[in-house]
């Protein structure tokens, strides 16, 4: 089968644009989720974010992030997640392993899961963009 040249497929300006878009969408998601009052962040959930042993953008745990956001989409019909998933798919290899998420069953715990992961996703995209831009600066020096 015709394999596509990976380097050719992802110029850094495209990757930066994808991550910028994800950062913006993550803020929209968080703003939407935070409108639910009386919900506290939980220590029980951790969204994988950046891998220390890979170069940007492959250091972003995109498949795992996608799985967590897909779970939120199933728990609470946030349409912005559809667009987030489409952009994450630009960073995910077709043969990336699947990530299984254990979903809370209690209604209030679901709300805590959604808030916690949304908050971590927003922070993660800030970090991802920083790692991209610092990586780009290092590459030019």
């Amino acid at each position: 089968s015709h394999t596509l040249p990976v380097r050719l497929l992802r110029p850094s300006d495209d990757v930066q644009k994808i991550v910028e878009e994800l950062q913006s969408l993550s803020k929209m998601l968080l703003k939407d989720v935070e409108e639910e009052k009386g919900v506290l962040v939980s220590q029980n959930y951790t969204l994988p974010c950046l891998s220390p042993d890979a170069q940007p953008p492959n250091n972003i745990h995109s498949p795992a992030i996608r799985a967590y956001l897909k779970t939120i989409r199933q728990l609470d019909n946030k349409s912005v997640i559809d667009e987030i998933i489409e952009h994450l798919d630009k960073l995910i290899f077709q043969d990336a392993p699947e990530t299984n998420i254990s979903v809370p069953t209690d209604t209030h715990e679901c709300k805590r899961f959604i808030l916690t992961i949304s908050q971590q996703f927003s922070e993660c995209m800030d970090l991802a963009l920083k790692s991209l831009t610092s990586g780009a600066q290092q590459a030019t020096t």
């Epitope: 015709h2 495209d14 489409e86 798919d89 630009k90 960073l91 077709q94 043969d95």
Partner: antibody, heavy 122, light 107 residues
């Protein structure tokens, strides 16, 4: 060799529904989006919607929302596009298409079905 | 939805001519653009993906380029077998809309 084989031509009455199938062979990846496109006689290509077969996640064109349903059966590697409340303007060739890798998101649709002609006539 | 404005809608050129077809996106879509060729009564065929990468088996006379939100398909030396309608399609976010098409004929 990757192949997409679509179901045969259909003649339908206005108000009825049509379900077109698209069977993929020679493709082992699960993370990809496939699309459905139609082309009315003498007209251009029109995007109808897409499905991520691994999860059954769908996206639809606003124009067809509520009338089109795209599904996939992972066990048979077959995708389906059902269009309801048919009218004469739905007379067209319907295509399924999907991309080559390496990423889950498409950059272009490398593989196309042969097309299914749907004629809507009373 | 992102609009793809394709021009011209039709053109007539001589064999050997250089032909250019343009698609303008209504917003920045990066390199997420493909070009297809469709001959009369045939299935669309991918020519260029990711704005400028040639699909397998596509003659070298076909090339794609990008300048901002403007995307160009160039046929460096038009051949009789290039008579077809050409379409662009973006893949930035759904809906993945197509341009209106450009019908290429031989003078």
């Amino acid at each position: 060799q990757v192949q997409l084989v679509q179901s045969g031509a259909e003649v339908k009455k206005p108000g009825s529904s049509v379900k077109v199938s698209c069977k993929a062979s020679g493709y082992t990846r699960t993370r990809y989006w496939m699309q459905w496109v139609r082309q009315a006689p003498g007209q251009g290509l029109e995007w109808m919607g897409a499905i991520y077969p691994g999860e059954g996640d769908t996206r639809y064109s606003q124009k067809f929302k509520g009338r089109v349903t795209i599904t996939a059966d992972k066990s048979t590697s077959t995708a389906y596009m059902e269009l309801s409340s048919l009218r004469s303007e739905d007379t067209a060739v319907y295509y399924c298409a999907f991309p080559e890798g390496p990423y889950a998101a498409p950059y272009g649709m490398h593989y196309w079905g042969q097309g299914t002609t749907v004629t809507v006539s009373s | 939805a992102i609009q793809m404005t394709q021009s011209p809608s039709s053109l007539s050129a001589s064999v050997g001519d250089r032909v250019t077809i343009t698609c303008r996106a209504s917003r920045n879509i990066g390199n997420y653009l493909a070009w297809y060729q469709q001959k009369p009564g045939k299935v669309p065929k991918l020519l260029i993906y990711y704005a400028k990468t040639s699909a397998e088996g596509v003659p070298s006379r076909f090339s794609g380029s990008r300048s901002g939100t403007d995307y160009t398909l160039t046929i460096s030396s038009l051949q009789p077998e290039d008579v077809a309608t050409y379409y662009c399609q973006h893949f930035w976010k759904t809906p993945w809309t197509f341009g209106g098409g450009t019908k290429v004929e031989i003078k």
